[in-house]
Interface confidence: low
């Protein structure tokens, strides 16, 4: 056959759905790889074409739209899936082709099981709420364009296994579910099952979210370092091992770039010729508050590395400060012998 | 923010029909009730009824089923109370509401300024 | 329909002291998930009503932290802990379990 342009396998695209459940997949090309739309591309004469490859096996297969109740079926640039079976999982590629043009791409599908208690191998999306912020609202995701507006829909909503109603402070109202006001007890893993009827036939969609309960921006304060500080002094003799930590905590802020950086002289550590290594490690508390340490280290300090400046920086979205630590070269103690001989005279 | 902007006051004889708006903006016009409460002159508040704008889903007060007609048009944010034949008790100041649905309840968060409808020979 | 009832009629107020409204619904509303279904309204003179509590005891949106709700499943009470001069006007509660929705009769708060 003629050349296509082939995207290869989209494993950015690794998606996910429940066994017995419906499925849409809109064909990747059109979202991510192309510069034109469904719509231009069927007006200019362009077939999309679907096939896939079992999972564990090569051979590339038409999809079989001829199944009962059009159990699969496609609709513009969508695959449907009325419902789901598990041995659906595999590679599904979406063609858009005709005489002279030609291009592919092909992504994972893999249908999974869940418990009773909505328990799965499925990646869960995060929410994050802010603690003590007043109503905020998660909204059961990924459900448009599976029935028209015209349907309503019951919502039961979950938080693990157990049905929320009687919940001190969650609220189920439809398609969203309000928390009046969140608190560290509310993370958790949250289920929307979204029941509708369609050609005398009743179907679910299960959407799972994890929620996380995160500082208060109203509580949020630039960083704070805690070391260097005014009352440590890093003494050393020259060939001694430097350690100086830089400590710093960041208030959480959605979206905010925590950095820290260390600077001699005013400069980078790699722009000094200088032999020094940076470890970091960061830390979380409960609501995502970040505590960042980055150990500055010489191995072999000479007298001229004991009389640099060292600064401490730090920034997130909330501002940017610095600390220089206290750096300098211990007075060496007296040697005996020397001082007792020239005590006596000798020569 | 959300807003909610009633068409102006009217004055109307007894017998004509009528139509008042309620626009809404600053927020998803199709994904929130919206009520309508008569307050007559000196009087308390009495709910008349409510639509889902997204599907036109209405729900009547009995003392106004028959009475009003409760529409909405969702292309343009907007929704609409009428009268067939107005009467002289039709006399009131109408507000319209938005209606949030937690469970099966509604409460009313933002209100419009409201229409004085004046029914006079 | 359930019928609700507010008392006082009037209730004149000194800037400062608390005040109290009362309202009783005719069947509980208590819905089985565990909120009661009771919104309280204020209505200052010449504007439109504006919602101060939902579901029995939750503070509405901007709404000061001096006015609270609370109430059993038939027996609700709106608070002020300390009368301001624009706290003026009717209040009305609202139950909110089942349409058709109905308004107590108003409480008119008036300064002394």
């Known amino acids: 056959s003629e050349r296509c342009d082939d995207w290869g396998l989209d494993t950015m695209r690794q998606i996910q759905v429940f066994e017995d459940e419906p499925a849409r997949i809109k064909c990747p090309l059109f979202e991510h790889f192309l510069k034109f739309n469904y719509s231009t591309a069927h007006s200019a004469g362009l077939t999309l074409i679907w096939y896939w490859t079992r999972q564990d096996r090569d051979l590339e297969e038409p999809i079989n739209f001829r199944l009962p109740e059009n159990r699969i079926s496609k609709e513009k640039d969508v695959l449907w899936f009325r419902p789901t079976l598990l041995n659906d999982t595999g590679n599904y590629t979406c063609m858009l082709r005709n005489t002279t043009y030609c291009s592919k791409v092909a992504f994972p599908l893999e249908v999974v099981q869940k418990d009773s208690c909505f328990n799965s191998p499925m990646k869960l999306p995060v929410h994050k709420l802010y603690i003590e912020y007043g109503i905020q609202r998660i909204t059961c995701p990924n459900v448009d364009g599976y029935f028209p507006s015209s349907v309503k829909p019951t919502i039961t909503w979950y938080m693990g296994c157990y049905k929320i109603q009687n919940f001190n402070n969650v609220i189920p109202e439809g398609m969203n579910l309000s928390f009046l006001i969140a608190l560290i007890s509310n993370n958790g893993n949250y289920t929307c099952v979204v029941t509708y009827p369609e050609n005398g036939r009743t179907f679910h969609l299960t959407r799972t979210l994890t929620v996380k309960v995160v500082g208060s921006p109203k509580n949020a304060v630039p960083p704070v370092i805690h070391s260097p500080n005014d009352h440590v002094v890093y003494e050393k003799e020259p060939g001694e091992e430097l350690l100086i930590p830089c400590t710093v905590y960041f208030s959480f802020l959605m979206d905010s770039r925590n950095e820290v950086w260390w600077t001699i002289d005013g400069k980078k550590p790699d722009d000094i010729t200088i032999d020094v290594t940076i470890n970091e490690s960061i830390s979380h508390s409960r609501t995502e508050d970040e505590t960042r340490t980055q150990i500055l280290s010489i191995k072999k300090v000479t007298s001229e590395d004991l009389k640099r400046s060292y600064v401490c920086h730090a920034r997130s979205a909330k501002g940017e400060v610095a600390k220089a630590a206290k750096v300098k070269q211990k007075v060496p103690a007296p040697r005996y012998t020397v001082e007792l001989a020239c005590g006596f005279g000798a020569t | 923010q959300v807003q909610l902007v009633q068409s102006g006051a009217e004055v109307k004889k007894p017998g004509e029909s009528l139509k008042i708006s309620c626009k809404g903006s600053?927020?998803?016009?199709?994904?929130?009730?919206i009520g309508w409460v008569r307050q007559m002159p000196g009087k308390g508040l009495e709910w008349m009824g409510i639509?889902?704008?997204?599907?036109?889903?209405?729900r009547y007060s009995p003392s106004f089923q028959g009475q009003v007609t409760i529409s909405a048009d969702k292309s343009i944010s907007t929704a609409y109370l009428q009268w067939s034949s107005l009467k002289a008790s039709d006399t009131a100041m109408y507000y319209c509401?938005?209606?949030?649905?937690?469970?099966?309840?509604?409460?009313?968060?933002?209100w419009g300024q409201g229409t004085l409808v004046t029914v006079s020979s | 329909e359930i019928v609700m009832t507010q008392s006082p009629l009037s209730l004149p107020v000194t800037p400062g002291e608390p005040a109290s409204i009362s309202c009783r619904s005719s069947?509980?509303?208590?819905?089985?998930?565990?909120?009661?279904?009771l919104d309280w309204y204020l209505q200052k003179p010449g504007q439109s009503p504006q919602l101060l509590i939902y579901l029995g005891s939750n503070r509405a949106s901007g709404v000061p932290d001096r006015f609270s709700g609370s109430g059993s499943g038939t027996d609700f009470t709106l608070k002020i802990s300390r009368v301001e001069a624009e706290d003026v006007g009717v209040y009305y509660c609202m139950q909110a379990l089942q349409t058709p929705l109905t308004f107590g009769g108003g409480t008119k708060v008036e300064i002394k």
């Open positions: 509401a938005r209606g949030e649905l937690p469970g099966e309840a509604y409460y009313f968060d933002n």
């Open positions: 639509i889902y704008p997204g599907d036109s889903d209405t």
């Open positions: 069947q509980s509303l208590l819905h089985s998930n565990g909120y009661k279904y």
């Open positions: 600053g927020y998803s016009f199709s994904s929130h009730w």
